[in-house]
Amino acid sequence: ARPMGYFELQLSALRNVNGELLSGACCDGDGRTTRAGGCGHDECDTYVRVCLKEYQAKVTPTGPCSYGHGATPVLGGNSFYLPPAGAAGDRARARARAGGDQDPGLVVIPFQFAWPRSFTLIVEAWDWDNDTTPNEELLIERVSHAGMINPEDRWKSLHFSGHVAHLELQIRVRCDENYYSATCNKFCRPRNDFFGHYTCDQYGNKACMDGWMGKECKEAVCKQGCNLLHGGCTVPGECRCSYGWQGRFCDECVPYPGCVHGSCVEPWQCNCETNWGGLLCDKDLNYCGSHHPCTNGGTCINAEPDQYRCTCPDGYSGRNCEKAEHACTSNPCANGGSCHEVPSGFECHCPSGWSGPTCALDIDECASNPCAAGGTCVDQVDGFECICPEQWVGATCQLDANECEGKPCLNAFSCKNLIGGYYCDCIPGWKGINCHINVNDCRGQCQHGGTCKDLVNGYQCVCPRGFGGRHCELERDECASSPCHSGGLCEDLADGFHCHCPQGFSGPLCEVDVDLCEPSPCRNGARCYNLEGDYYCACPDDFGGKNCSVPREPCPGGACRVIDGCGSDAGPGMPGTAASGVCGPHGRCVSQPGGNFSCICDSGFTGTYCHENIDDCLGQPCRNGGTCIDEVDAFRCFCPSGWEGELCDTNPNDCLPDPCHSRGRCYDLVNDFYCACDDGWKGKTCHSREFQCDAYTCSNGGTCYDSGDTFRCACPPGWKGSTCAVAKNSSCLPNPCVNGGTCVGSGASFSCICRDGWEGRTCT
């Protein structure tokens, strides 16, 4: 299986000045004894072996390399130097690799488990001898280091001065390319198929590709404006309607088939228009109003759908009052007209000056339509008068009026007087003859139940919780800011997020270090130390293992013997003292009268037999939540994330180098930073615009559409380019109008329509 990460060790120097082994013998000496004149120059053929295992406060060089092991080839003689880790060394090694060489001083130990952060490293330098397998005789030096390391690209330098040799090396832990977090156990590999369409951000979170959304980036972003209640999509940019819905945005219901004078609110309805009825709205309920069938002044009455009745005046009959009976008896002819009965009714013979079927029409001077331009003619006794429309003046409305003098245009660049009218050049977002109507830009663009607010030349979506973006099309990923601490896995929910914490951590943000020492897992009276996401048992001398449950052989040298007093004479070290076994490895025995003794303890030890290590952690020296581990006459602090230094009192500046873009101000936090963004910017590093569109984003009356991290300008006729600043007409190329002016080109000449507050040929 593929590793989750790699522990890398780069050896950069080894100095074995005398060219000797740990035993004191020379590397190439016969019988492996030291020669009186010292060892020869470059007798050692040095290679290095590396062992990586769980953290041990007291390092035991034996036992399995539980995290892995590795070795180098022979690197040199008694002393040698290699390019160090880091930029300069990387370049040197790259040149060596380009020449086909392997990097000799680099040991890479892959691991396939969550990196525990604490570790023990044992580095051994050996002398190569073709004739023998490695045995303790060939060991030049053994050094060890126990500590903590987080995955990162930076190298950590270690220096060791051993009994025989001095070693310099660098170490680091790096996650494999598809693994993330402080423990390298968060997997993310970019993909672009039905399992998801995403790349991975620096924290291992899925970053959806354009056109995709959702936790797994499997959901397509539909066409802008698509009504997601009645339509949807499986590929980006589509809007496929559910059964019963139609239209570009699936916002029009399908009416009942055959519906004539009706419409629907829900699919398959046929809601009739006024005066229409029937299942298909094809029955006329107002036959009288639409057909006017009754003649000769008859009154029409609607009956059944498509039916009517005529109530005829005296002297008329028939279905439509079309038959006349003694029509002249009612004296229908006015103004002195004479009446004559005819089969269809009556006929009036009118005196001069009058006309019409009942002589009611005055023949006047307006009959010749003397008023031009749609003027209204009023007949007078001695002539006529023309009432002219606003755009015209004169006796017969033949002269063009200049309507622009009355300043009729409200929200316009300019007013132009036309023959028989005027033209208002509206500012984007306004319409109507006088540019007085605010264009309603709300056309169902707001998705996921967002409310649309109409603005001038634009709109704003007020999104429900959990959604954002110009059209509420973005599911706000509350995990984007990586709120979970301690390697917790973040799950984005509809109304927030949830952190799945690794073992040893709890709390809504995995910020609470669970005390793994409650109850204590340590056996045989060992003291338990709670670490960040782990614990450490300080074992008594006679037990070992993670939980101090493995007995150690108390007398490695053989059976114990009964000691009388100190069991030996006073040694050369101190009058009356001896290095007897009774006081252990950390004390000297002083014989007392009567076969008794007392122990004088080495620094850092106490007790009758000097077997108790003095607790150097009693004063709680570790700061900022660091965990103190007692060592011999010393202590070691294990620091929580975001703190370092011997006492965990150094907070590294996470603002170096400055991560904030767009003039954002960086504030250093513990193991984090905060960017205070300038107006108009947002995001963890102020890399995204708050709103991509403003009144000046698109030039020349272009309409701006905000699409999250970018914008798009829909240009009016005659303009093109990302901001509509490029004129298709050559005389406006490049745009000569400044300060937002609109260029109007005609052949080789142009004119500028300036914005309010600007004037001049080019709006300067």
Epitope: R2, G196, K218, T234
Partner: antibody, heavy 123, light 107 residues
Framework: EVQLVESGGGLVQPGGSLRLSCAAS????????IHWVRQAPGKGLEWVGG????????DYANSVKGRFTISADTSKNTAYLQMNSLRAEDTAVYYC????????????????WGQGTLVTVSS | DIQMTQSPSSLSASVGDRVTITCRAS??????VAWYQQKPGKAPKLLIY???FLYSGVPSRFSGSGSGTDFTLTISSLQPEDFATYYC?????????FGQGTKVEIK
Amino acid sequence: EVQLVESGGGLVQPGGSLRLSCAASGFTFTSYDIHWVRQAPGKGLEWVGGISPADGDTDYANSVKGRFTISADTSKNTAYLQMNSLRAEDTAVYYCARNDYDVRTVGSGMDYWGQGTLVTVSS
Amino acid sequence: DIQMTQSPSSLSASVGDRVTITCRASQDVSTAVAWYQQKPGKAPKLLIYSASFLYSGVPSRFSGSGSGTDFTLTISSLQPEDFATYYCQQSYTSAPTFGQGTKVEIK
């Protein structure tokens, strides 16, 4: 040499259950997807479902959703297809196949297939 | 789900003929289309991936083209070992789907 070997097929009654295994060798198991594809007698290929062993992400065809479950054991380099509530129309040869994926290449295809195992659902 | 419609469902051809099989997707699937060859009693074999890339070890007489909704598999000069059933498959979105297959028989 890349190899995929299916096992676990056989005769089962309608409503019964069966578990198929797909043992993989010769490649890094967690670097590929594993898919199950079936072929009813005399018919075409039908995708059943797939798994990304590295993160356990799964997807299924609508016809088997809720009845079939795909899992993977990365320590054994083996993928499994647990089939419950079996129907006569599930009778087919079941293949497992591996699929490489790369963000730069859409539609990378299933490049290695097993020999197939026959599942018969009949009373 | 996206439907993949293959045509023709079968064809007869002679050795040396140029053969073209088409596959139409019910929606845009970018270039996420693969082509397979299957012989009776055997597992399918990958020929073309990403619409137009020849899989390693496949003879160069096989080629693929197309993007969006229309895709084509071409065998420039049919060989005896090419008589088999060919399937297209999309893996762009929702559940991956196969075409119904095209059987290429000897005339």
